[in-house]
Interface confidence: medium
């Protein structure tokens, strides 16, 4: 049986339930990997309270419609004269980015995730060359998600003291250049989410291959590399690469513009305030 | 104030049965999650049952399909039904309570099996 959503394929997804301090390991083409889940779980359930682990959702035992993904295990359930077995049920909707799964609510015998994502979309109007994970969720189960800075069309101008070049990015996505003809940008390779600008010529300095990463408190980074093997020849025989660094500010003010702190052989380091990079709870307070 | 009561604890025999029950007071039982754990003599405290929020239960192997975990909103109580009791299920149980405000341990009551 094909992939339903081959765009959501690559990467195992997380979902949490906040209020029984449970974290979900989802990977809807094939296992995630996870040896206590056993070999073929689709769905893994980690109890971080009581550190153990349960499939609620087998890959092989998957079905599918166009909006529907149901994994099905072999675990009974404790449902009254009964025969139902332990599943998981995953509604998609459309959506302007890969999105993220959203943990519902469960039953004894059914958990319940909801996944607004490009990849359920009818028409590919919003659907990227390239797109990765955007979100991450640290210890304590706090959500950081910066699937608001994804653009859907056109970029972000890097904050550069170089007057000759420019240095365009998007997050967690290659750049839509079709749907925004600016100039600068129109030159831009396909597949690109680092478009650096040297008067009329456009290079790809880097796409985005891993999901966003956590790595300390309230600072998430984006690594994004030039997958294509040809060398820049400005870049003295090194292969470019774009590391962005999210901060959540340390008090609430307004967000800065992405600015780059470290340039060399066309390695960029960038470094980007935003409360986007603050956990959920904080941003809804 | 959170307080967490367990009661029916006892002695009994290899193969016997015992219902633990935990009545709370200051929380709203069916909005959250329950854990019932144990410690033997001389041993780490270890999990034994869990009854999520919407209803969903996992048990420890050392328990499955001889203990079952129940909840009665309406008498704001948790219950622990103990089957096929063996000796080395001797051990202080504790009903535990997590909530986002924070989580509450009962003073734990003593389950002995012996002949």
């Known amino acids: 049986q094909a992939a339903p959503f081959p765009e959501l394929c690559s990467y195992t997804w997380e979902a949490v339930d906040t209020k029984n301090n449970v974290l979900y390991k989802i990977n809807i083409c094939g296992s995630v990997d996870i040896v206590q889940c056993g070999p073929s779980s689709a769905v893994c359930m980690h109890d971080l309270k009581t550190r153990t682990y349960h499939s609620v959702g087998d890959s092989v035992l998957r079905s599918a419609t166009r909006s529907l993904l149901e994994f099905n295990t072999t675990v009974s359930c404790d449902q009254q004269g009964t025969n139902h077995r332990v599943q998981s049920s995953i509604a998609f909707l459309c959506g302007k980015t890969l999105g993220t799964p959203e943990f519902v609510t469960a039953t004894e015998c059914v958990h319940y995730f909801e996944w607004r994502t490009t990849a359920a979309c009818k028409k590919d109007i919003f659907k990227a060359n390239k797109e990765v994970p955007c979100y991450v969720f640290d210890e304590e189960l706090r959500k950081h998600d910066l699937n608001p800075l994804i653009k859907l069309s056109g970029a972000y101008l890097v904050d550069d003291s170089d007057p000759d070049t420019s240095l365009f990015i998007n997050v967690c996505r290659d750049i839509d250049t079709l749907r925004d003809p600016g100039s600068q940008l129109r030159a831009c390779p396909p597949g690109t989410a680092a478009c650096l600008v040297r008067g009329h010529q456009a290079f790809d300095v880097g796409q985005p291959r891993d999901g966003l990463k956590l790595v300390r408190k309230d600072r998430l980074v984006l690594s994004y590399v030039r997958e294509e093997a040809g060398k820049l020849d400005f870049c003295d025989g090194h292969s470019p690469a774009v590391t962005i660094t999210f901060v959540c500010p340390s008090e609430r003010r307004e967000g800065t513009i992405p600015k780059l702190t470290a340039k060399s052989n066309c390695r960029y380091e960038i470094e980007w305030i935003t409360e986007y990079a603050c956990h959920r709870d904080y941003l809804e307070s | 104030q959170v307080q967490l009561q367990e009661s029916g604890g006892g002695l009994v025999q290899p193969g016997g049965s015992l219902r633990l029950s935990c009545a709370a007071s200051?929380?709203?039982?069916?909005?959250?999650?329950m854990d019932w754990y144990r410690q033997a003599p001389g041993k780490q405290r270890e999990w034994v049952a869990t009854?999520?929020?919407?209803?969903?239960?996992?048990?420890?192997?050392s328990v499955k399909d001889r203990f079952t975990i129940s909840r009665d909103n309406a008498k704001n109580t948790v219950n622990l039904y103990m089957n096929s009791l063996q000796p080395e299920d001797t051990a202080v149980v504790h009903h535990h309570y997590y909530c986002?405000?924070?989580?509450?341990w009962g003073q734990g009551t003593q389950v002995t099996v012996s002949s």
């Open positions: 986002n405000s924070g989580q509450y």
């Open positions: 200051g929380i709203i039982f069916s909005d959250n999650r």
């Open positions: 009854l999520a929020s919407y209803g969903w239960k996992t048990y420890a192997d």
